[in-house]
């Protein structure tokens, strides 16, 4: 996972990276494989009904440093992990939802699971 302290000017890769994509496959993907000059990612977030949804795919080099930084968003439970070390490396990423804060129970809707 990329850490906050990493450089904000990512170095261009000399070669294309292939990633698994799920719920996030661009038009130029084939057999749930996309290609990128940036990073592979896996993300988990809550949908409108509070259920966890996992998506994965490719992030282009432009702006991916920011997207991979996983900055907390108020009132949104979401976690993203990025990788570049090998093709389809995001198959092995398993981000987890950040824990619920107390006020989330108060502010948010009540879900029965």
């Amino acid at each position: 996972k990329k850490e906050d302290g990493e450089s904000t000017a990512p170095t261009p890769r000399p070669k294309v990276l292939r990633c698994k994509c799920h719920h996030h496959c661009p038009e130029d993907s084939v057999n749930n494989i996309c290609s990128t000059d940036g990073y592979c990612f896996t993300m988990i977030e809550e949908d409108d009904s509070g259920l966890p949804v996992v998506t994965s795919g490719c992030l282009g080099l432009e702006g991916s440093d920011f997207q991979c930084r996983d900055t907390p968003i108020p009132h949104q439970r979401r976690s993203i992990e990025c990788c570049t070390e090998r093709n389809e490396c995001n198959k092995d990423l398993h981000p987890t939802l950040p824990p619920l804060k107390n006020r989330d129970f108060v502010d948010g809707p009540i879900h029965h699971r």
């Epitope: 000399p14 996309c34 290609s35 432009e62």
Partner: antibody, heavy 116, light 112 residues
Framework: QVQLQQPGAELVKPGASVKLSCKAS????????MQWVKQRPGQGLEWIGE????????LYNQKFKGKATLTVDTSSSTAYMQLSSLTSEDSAVYYC?????????WGLGTTLTVSS | DVVMTQTPLSLPVSLGDQASIFCRSS???????????LHWYLQKPGQSPKLLIY???NRFSGVPDRFSGSGSGTDFTLKISRVEAEDLGVYFC?????????FGSGTKLEIK
């Protein structure tokens, strides 16, 4: 300078298999994909597939799945393509080519002749 | 598969003339990263192809500035401003946006 060395010619009998080689030099072998391209006279260029030497990850043109198998030996910076169950349709020039986001260097090609 | 249609098939020119070769793809070559992976190669008789232009308009190292590439989406052009004898051969366009990667059928540049 970047060089991709391929044997000039191979003669094989129908039904047999052949393993074509491509020795890379002048760059870090694992930093680029290696592609293979087929060229028959009057038939243009056909992309067979590619392999990433850093993790042996392969992508094939559906048309060549079962026909071509791509491998690498990183210790000798050599890429290989095995072609099986050869027929006269496989007679062609086969190029290896270095690929990052586009092919920038090509080997000189191996002329494969399938004949009894 | 993306079909790359090249025109003309043959282009007779006089030395010093300008030459234009066209390439049309059956679908857009704009990649999801925003890049357009359309490239041009020259193959001389008995040789392997050599890269001239990558990503539509970027000249590869050592390629003379009389070669230029342009276009977007599905329509692309290679221009040679003043044809020299060493430019004769077969020109191919190629796309690496969509797998499987595909090539144009080639344009043979020859002397009139």
């Amino acid at each position: 300078q970047v060089q991709l060395q391929q044997p000039g010619a191979e003669l094989v009998k129908p039904g047999a298999s052949v393993k074509l080689s491509c020795k890379a030099s002048g760059y870090t072998f694992t930093s680029y994909w290696m592609q293979w391209v087929k060229q028959r006279p009057g038939q243009g260029l056909e992309w067979i597939g590619e392999i990433d030497p850093s993790d042996n990850y392969t992508l094939y043109n559906q048309k060549f799945k079962g026909k071509a198998t791509l491998t690498v030996d990183t210790s000798s910076s050599t890429a290989y393509m095995q072609l099986s169950s050869l027929t006269s349709e496989d007679s062609a020039v086969y190029y290896c080519a270095r690929f990052g986001y586009y092919v920038d260097y090509w080997g000189l090609g191996t002329t494969l002749t399938v004949s009894s | 598969d993306v079909v790359m249609t090249q025109t003309p098939l043959s282009l007779p020119v006089s030395l010093g003339d300008q030459a234009s070769i066209f390439c049309r793809s059956s679908q857009s070559l704009v990649h999801s990263t925003g890049n357009t992976y359309l490239h041009w190669y020259l193959q001389k008789p008995g040789q392997s192809p050599k890269l001239l232009i990558y990503k539509v308009s970027n000249r590869f190292s050592g390629v003379p500035d009389r070669f230029s590439g342009s276009g977007s989406g599905t329509d692309f052009t290679l221009k040679i401003s003043r044809v020299e004898a060493e430019d004769l051969g077969v020109y191919f366009c190629s796309q690496s946006t969509h797998v499987p990667f595909t090539f144009g059928s080639g344009t043979k540049l020859e002397i009139k």
